[in-house]
Amino acid sequence: APVRSLNCTLRDSQQKSLVMSGPYELKALHLQGQDMEQQVVFSMSFVQGEESNDKIPVALGLKEKNLYLSCVLKDDKPTLQLESVDPKNYPKKKMEKRFVFNKIEINNKLEFESAQFPNWYISTSQAENMPVFLGGTKGGQDITDFTMQFVSS
């Protein structure tokens, strides 16, 4: 069965949008008007994972690109990257753990916890135009809350 997916954009809780910054990096910045077209559209796939009553496992691919957000150790630190995959094999229901995020909904906001590295979250900086990264703290300076906007396919 084809994996169930939906197209969406994400904005952090300060309303910063996510855009490509080079071929393998995302950054977060405020966009307005026609510039909104720059924001990346994700294909969010609902995959197998350690699902709980308040965590839904998803994979975040870039729509119509063979790139997925993944979590790996770099220099002994959990790191967010965009990873290229074989489009013939992805998306799939049984994604490797590094591609899986636990989508957590709290007060109409979303968090994306790495399945590979529990308590590490997709994060943005308070500052403008900084890379999207994997952060190990919640409720501090860095932003881990997002809203999702559905995009028609």
Partner: antibody, heavy 122, light 107 residues
Amino acid sequence: EVQLQESGPGLVKPSETLSLTCTVSGFSLSDYGVSWIRQPPGKGLEWIGLIWGSGDTYYNSPLKSRLTISKDNSKSQVSLKLSSVTAADTAVYYCAKQTNIWAYDLYSMDYWGQGTLVTVSS
Amino acid sequence: DIQMTQSPSSLSASVGDRVTITCQTSTDIDDDLNWYQQKPGKAPKLLISLASTLRPGVPSRFSGSGSGTDFTFTISSLQPEDFATYYCLQSDRLPLTFGQGTKLEIK
């Protein structure tokens, strides 16, 4: 060798809380999920819920409001608590280990305890 | 939740017979289907996972096939120790759901 063993009182009064413990060996509770399943006398199997290695839980909807699954990794024990029991909760209760193989077979249950019969009666 | 329809609910057969049990799911689950054997007073034992993968130590007379929504479990030549109840389980998504069971009795 993987082993699971359920224990707890065999008789619980209606409206009270059923409490069971699953003690495991041969694997670590921080690495593998454990499910609870029950089987009323002469009937089929019903999946109750599970606790993952992370401690996150998934409870099956019909029992969700009455169910708590928790664990103590250091004691290799998983506990099940089911509140406000009625005669309909009379069953053999099993715990089982999840296969937990990512991108292959995450949700199957490969090893089971021998089960413990719990009767709800006054 | 995924609904499971297992048939038949009971089956009488003789030693040496070939026996087939079917399991149908309400939605496509690819190959995430398991078969368990349960003897009276005992815990279920996993025989087959991923629709057709025989678990270590399980005799080769047991086999499974199917994908999507339709699955089959076969015992090629019944042995006396095979008389038991068999259950299918979908492991595609939570909550996990079982078939109603098939009781295999001696004719």
